[in-house]
Amino acid sequence: TCEIVTLDRDSSQPRRTIARQTARCACRKGQIAGTTRARPACVDARIIKTKQWCDMLPCLEGEGCDLLINRSGWTCTQPGGRIKTTTVS
């Protein structure tokens, strides 16, 4: 089970919204807080350790997941071509 603790949005840049979200999750052993279908979720800890973010299925149904080359996060591409980038910190 997960709950969103903080959600900050910055829409000051044209055509770009930066959102910072923190979630608190109660996860089973071997799991850790992550993102599944664009929602906070408990995921296999190995996914986080190896930075194979797309294995969490972080994008919405119908979106395409693409790892950032430096493994700092992932992008979700909507069918229309719009790209949403998520970086992990």
Partner: antibody, heavy 122, light 109 residues
Framework: AVTLDESGGGLQTPGGALRLSCKAS????????MGWVRQAPGKGLEWVSA????????SYGSAVKGRATISRDNGQSTLYLQMNSLRAEDTAVYFC???????????????WGHGTEVIVSS | ALTQPSSVSANPGETARITCSGG??????YGWYQQKPSSAPLTVIY???ERPSDIPSRFSGSSSGSTHTLTISGVQAEDEAVYFC??????????????FGAGTTLTVL
Amino acid sequence: AVTLDESGGGLQTPGGALRLSCKASGFTFSSYQMGWVRQAPGKGLEWVSAINKGGSDTSYGSAVKGRATISRDNGQSTLYLQMNSLRAEDTAVYFCAKGSASYITAATIDAWGHGTEVIVSS
Amino acid sequence: ALTQPSSVSANPGETARITCSGGASSGYGYGWYQQKPSSAPLTVIYKDSERPSDIPSRFSGSSSGSTHTLTISGVQAEDEAVYFCGNDDYSSDSGYVGVFGAGTTLTVL
């Protein structure tokens, strides 16, 4: 079968520019991250650049950073490498590489092109 | 950088082992690439132990701690080549960037 066919190499002058191409077939090009690896005469393999599936994110080895641009055309199943301000030390065979399982690292290459030779000399 | 021996030799039918160490622990494992003179590299192992379908089963990869090993069981004359290992290096400005070992020449006696 997976095929990666590079072109665009040849004799280049120092300070010049070139664009290498890699035509892919035998797999769904847009589903895989791709990269370029080069090999100077008599030397080992050197990582050059990589690009994610959609083309929105790239990375470069230190030897070419600031002089190279990797791009892709998923509609044409083609990978590109634009190299500017060429130096003698860019002389090498350039190989196109396909990542496995939708991501590419030097540990996950599962297919290579035959290579295209670039010679930078005055 | 990755460290691997410059040369390894084995008699036909014997087992040859090539080791590789170093690089960043990125979780993506190690790759092993065979290259014969005037030819492109050929992937024999990727992601530590996965083998492309057209590679003979005598090629296998394994890891023990920080050492990664390519094992060729029952070496054949056609296995004579240079073998490169591949992994990642990490830098704060570039993140993860691919890196290869200098290559190990396998000689079949």
